[in-house]
């Protein structure tokens, strides 16, 4: 069964830095992907960016760069400019769509004992999967 | 302006077969997925066939799995459904429809329709 | 596949009411798509993505949901608004569509 996985890491340099990392576990090519924080998107979450394998990306603030790392996975980069850090407690979510087969959703924050530059394990939380 | 134009519709036989176009004008036709929609008497929307950009992957239904065939010719900006082994329950118009991808592959731009009658 | 049920079927309201229709489905999905047809017309796209409103659609309209439940409002109704809405998925294959909500105007 194809799964999502979620990573978030705080910048070991910029403690305002935060890089959320995604990847897809499964057969098929990815067609969409998107990012959202706060929770799942179009359920309380709110959209980060949108990734399309050749027609490019969209972002939305506080997005700064979203890019692909490999074929079936993506990197977010954050950058928190208020003097609070309100990434820290956030759930980021993503979702990775292989259009028409289906489409599958993780979240993951970053761990509260994270040192910085430390990441989350890459352990798949599927919350919303297609059958 | 995104043009999509059905046509081949008409009446058959049970068991005969049919083969619709889609005309498509107005957009570079080989960058989206399309797909085949059809409405019955009832008003009950059905997808029957889908094909993604390259044209190399297909999706159908269980319904009508083995015996409808989608297929595009990015050349001529044409979509096709050959339909064999009709049966009754095939009357409907049949739409072409348009996926955007940024648009979450949502059915943004739909042809007008052509019907096809499957009677005795 | 993932069945979609519209609710109600059928639907009257007064120009300048605000109406509400549901769709539910038979197992969680991630994206939800409303639909708009008139008679004698093709559908045309309302709502992407479960909130997102396509081009040209007035801002009367608006969608939200989550998980199996999915809803369409329409703000403050006018006569151009009588048509029968459906809710589509693609979360998994096939794409399926409710059966629709005919919205009559008195």
């Known amino acids: 069964t194809p799964e999502v996985w979620v990573q978030v890491q705080m910048e070991a340099t910029e403690l305002s830095s935060f890089t959320v990392h995604c990847g897809f576990l499964g057969p098929g090519s990815i067609s969409l992907v998107t990012v959202s924080w706060g929770g799942p998107d179009g359920a309380g979450g709110t959209k980060l960016a949108v990734l399309h394998p050749e027609l490019g990306t969209r972002q939305w603030a506080p997005a700064r760069q979203a890019r692909w790392e490999t074929q079936s996975s993506i990197s977010l980069a954050l950058e928190d400019s208020g003097a609070s850090s309100p990434f820290a407690n956030t759930t980021f979510c993503c979702k990775f769509a292989s259009f028409p087969e289906g489409s599958w959703e993780s979240c993951g924050s970053l761990p509260p004992s994270s040192d910085p530059g430390l990441s989350a394990p890459p352990t798949p939380v599927p919350i919303l999967r297609a059958d | 302006e995104v043009q999509l134009v059905e046509s081949g519709g008409g009446l058959v036989k049970p068991g005969g077969s049919l083969k619709l176009s889609c005309a498509a004008s107005?957009?570079?036709?080989?960058?989206?997925?399309m797909s085949w929609v059809r409405q019955t008497p009832a008003m009950r929307l059905e997808s029957v066939a889908t094909?993604?950009?390259?044209?190399?992957?297909?999706y159908y239904p269980d319904t009508v799995k083995g015996r409808f065939t989608v297929s595009r010719d990015n050349a001529k900006n044409t979509l096709y459904l050959q339909m064999s082994s009709l049966r009754s329950e095939d009357t409907a118009i049949y739409y072409c429809?348009?996926?955007?991808?940024?648009?979450?592959?949502?059915?943004?731009?739909w042809g007008q329709g052509t019907s096809v009658t499957v009677s005795s | 596949q993932i069945v979609l049920t519209q609710s109600p079927a059928i639907m009257s309201a007064s120009p300048g009411e605000k109406v509400t229709m549901t769709c539910s489905a038979s197992?969680?999905?991630?994206?939800m798509f409303w639909y708009q047809q008139k008679p004698g017309s093709s559908p045309r796209l309302l709502i992407y993505?479960?909130?997102n409103l396509a081009s040209g659609v007035p801002v009367r309209f608006s969608g939200s949901g989550s998980g199996t439940s999915y809803s369409l409002t329409i703000s403050r109704l006018e006569a151009e608004d009588a048509a029968t809405y459906y809710c589509?998925?693609?979360?998994?294959?096939?794409?399926?569509f409710g059966a629709g909500t005919k919205l009559d105007l008195k």
């Open positions: 429809a348009r996926h955007d991808d940024f648009l979450y592959y949502a059915m943004d731009y």
């Open positions: 107005g957009f570079t036709f080989s960058n989206f997925a």
């Open positions: 094909i993604v950009n390259g044209g190399i992957n297909t």
């Open positions: 197992s969680s999905v991630n994206y």
């Open positions: 993505d479960t909130s």
């Open positions: 589509q998925q693609w979360t998994s294959y096939p794409l399926t």
